[in-house]
């Protein structure tokens, strides 16, 4: 009679994470008598997966009834597969012995590969806001996928970006992998409504890539432009001066009026108007009693936007002449080292 052979017909098996893997194994003879055991890996460090004779293996079920005398099918199913289950599985026939069974013959092995979906990409931007015309870095991370092959793309408002670097780790063999990519994005004045998208394509996703997004509204700071103008006379001794604060983002803004360098009023932008591009406009006005001033008055509109150093614009109010419509004066004065008189 021909000697028993252990047949593992599948050289490799590919299973998606969470599914059940079937590892096939048949023997060509009933003799010698003895149990079958399944191992992952070979050599002294191999891991026992299933023992026909004894033990508790909750994730493993047999395909056929191993208690039947004439059974020669020793195939098993392993449930709820994870990337950690990847490896080469050996079906090994033992011969009954005393006191211990003796290994008789091993199958050629079946390599179990696990397909695991990448986690949802997480996109993060710079730690602080940046202004238009600057290039900032965004990172995208996704983890836990297998096999290693993966494609990552970056988009800004649907337009593909080319300036990025991507790494997949680890470099060598692993049960699962991670991807990390850094893209450089140029901010423009119109980016308040823009989005940066990281798109990950993998064999497990069946052509439906995963996307992570970042809103540039969380990254950009658009500094305001200031314009101070004098309005027509409201009453004989009163002049209305307005400070137009235009095209700023985010909304957080505090405005201070100074008369000859002395604080007259401070207010916080509340009832702003929103522009189509997502930036805001705001107007503040100051009623100046001209009769209270003997000399010309320097009115300064000082704005602190989003916690940045204050910027300001000044206007010289001529008291000596009869109050009339005046434009914004050129002379301006800083009142502190952290204040910038803009435009």
């Amino acid at each position: 009679e021909e000697e028993l052979q252990v047949i593992q017909p599948d050289k490799s098996v590919l299973v998606a994470a969470g599914e059940t893997a079937t590892l096939r194994c048949t023997a060509t003879s009933l003799i010698p008598v003895g149990p079958i055991q399944w191992f992952r890996g070979a050599g002294p460090g191999r891991e026992l997966i299933y023992n026909q004779k004894e033990g508790h293996f909750p994730r493993v079920t047999t395909v056929s009834d191993l208690t039947k005398r004439n059974n020669m099918d020793f195939s098993i199913r392993i449930g709820n597969i994870t990337p950690a289950d990847a490896g080469t599985y050996y079906c090994v026939k033992f011969r009954k012995g005393s006191p211990d069974d003796v290994e008789f013959k091993s199958g050629a092995g079946t390599e179990l590969s696990v397909r695991a979906k990448p986690s949802a990409p997480v996109v993060s931007g710079p730690a602080a806001r940046a202004t238009p015309q600057h290039t900032v870095s965004f990172t995208c991370e996704s983890h836990g996928f297998s096999p290693r092959d993966i494609t990552l793309k970056w988009f800004k408002n649907g337009n593909e970006l080319s300036d990025f670097q991507t790494n997949v780790d680890p470099v060598g063999e692993s049960v699962s992998y991670s991807i990390h990519s850094t893209a450089k994005v140029v901010l423009t004045r119109e980016d308040v409504h823009s989005q940066v998208i990281c798109e990950v394509a993998h064999v497990t996703l069946q052509g439906d890539p995963l996307r992570g997004t970042a809103n540039l509204s969380e990254t950009i700071r658009v500094p305001p432009t200031l314009e101070v103008t004098q309005q027509p006379v409201r009453a004989e001794n009163q002049v209305n001066v307005t400070c137009q604060v235009r095209k700023f983002y985010p909304q957080r803004l505090q405005l201070t009026w100074l008369e000859n360098g002395n604080v007259s009023r401070t207010e916080t932008a509340s009832t702003v108007t929103e522009n189509k591009d997502g930036t805001y406009n705001w107007m503040s006005w100051l009623l100046v009693n001209v009769s209270a001033h003997r000399d010309d008055v320097k009115l300064t509109c000082q704005v602190e936007h989003d916690g940045q150093p204050a910027v300001s614009k000044s206007h010289d109010l001529k008291v000596s002449a009869h109050p009339k419509e005046q434009g914004s004066n050129t002379a301006a004065e800083n009142t502190g080292s952290n204040e910038r008189n803009i435009y």
Partner: antibody, heavy 119, light 107 residues
Framework: QVQLVQSGAEVKKPGASVKVSCKAS????????IHWVRQAPGQGLEWMGD????????ANNQKFKGRVTMTRDTSTSTVYMELSSLRSEDTAVYYC????????????WGQGTLVTVSS | DIQMTQSPSSLSASVGDRVTITCKAS??????VAWYQQKPGKAPKLLIY???SLETGVPSRFSGSGSGTDFTFTISSLQPEDIATYYC?????????FGGGTKVEIK
């Protein structure tokens, strides 16, 4: 008071790189941009780029085609400008200067660093 | 890139004279113009920004005006200490660009 202190003069061979530092003090480092401007002997001023220490955002003069790298170390309030693939025409005084983020007029300047490129 | 054409490239004037330097931008830069003074062997010094705003501590004899593409820098009464080279700079669109400079000398 506001100060920008730059590293000392450098002599480099063509093809080499130079890294100039600019240490800021007297103000909140992350609130202002640091710009780099160079001036060749007897020539005018040329803007190279800037970095915002808070966000790490940079703007570059494309004339330098990726030869300029600007980095910052917030722990030491220092900005670095590295210029690679040096050629003789890169011989110049390199200045760092401070500007309010988004407004770009440079109100405080470093003392300048002379970089000489010669074989 | 936006070109800043500065003129004249040099001028000679007497103490007390009114000195005017012009800068023309190749496209509209609104009012995003600064003027700097540079003395030999020294770093530039900001005098004017936002076309017309005077930097802290800068004497009032220095002034600026203009908008759009045409800008003017004026020294109302030239002083001996004003001998220097003056540069305009636009900061509307990157790369920020400077004019070629105007060397001011005293007769």
């Amino acid at each position: 008071q506001v100060q920008l202190v730059q590293s000392g003069a450098e002599v480099k061979k063509p093809g080499a790189s130079v890294k100039v530092s600019c240490k800021a003090s007297g103000y909140t480092f992350t609130d202002y941009e640091i710009h780099w401007v160079r001036q060749a002997p007897g020539q005018g001023l040329e803007w190279m780029g800037d970095i915002h220490p808070g966000s790490g955002g940079t703007a570059n003069n494309q004339k330098f085609k990726g030869r300029v790298t600007m980095t910052r170390d917030t722990s030491t309030s220092t900005v670095y400008m590295e210029l690679s693939s040096l050629r003789s025409e890169d011989t110049a005084v390199y200045y760092c200067a401070r500007a309010v983020s988004g407004y770009y007029a440079m109100d405080y300047w470093g003392q300048g660093t002379l970089v000489t490129v010669s074989s | 890139d936006i070109q800043m054409t500065q003129s004249p490239s040099s001028l000679s004037a007497s103490v007390g004279d009114r000195v005017t330097i012009t800068c023309k931008a190749s496209e509209d830069i609104y009012d995003r113009v600064a003027w700097y003074q540079q003395k030999p062997g020294k770093a530039p010094k900001l005098l004017i920004y936002g076309t017309a705003s005077l930097e802290t501590g800068v004497p009032s004899r220095f002034s600026g005006s203009g908008s759009g593409t045409d800008f003017t820098f004026t020294i109302s009464s030239l002083q001996p200490e004003d001998i220097a080279t003056y540069y305009c700079q636009q900061y509307w669109t990157t790369p920020w660009t400077f004019g070629g400079g105007t060397k001011v000398e005293i007769k």
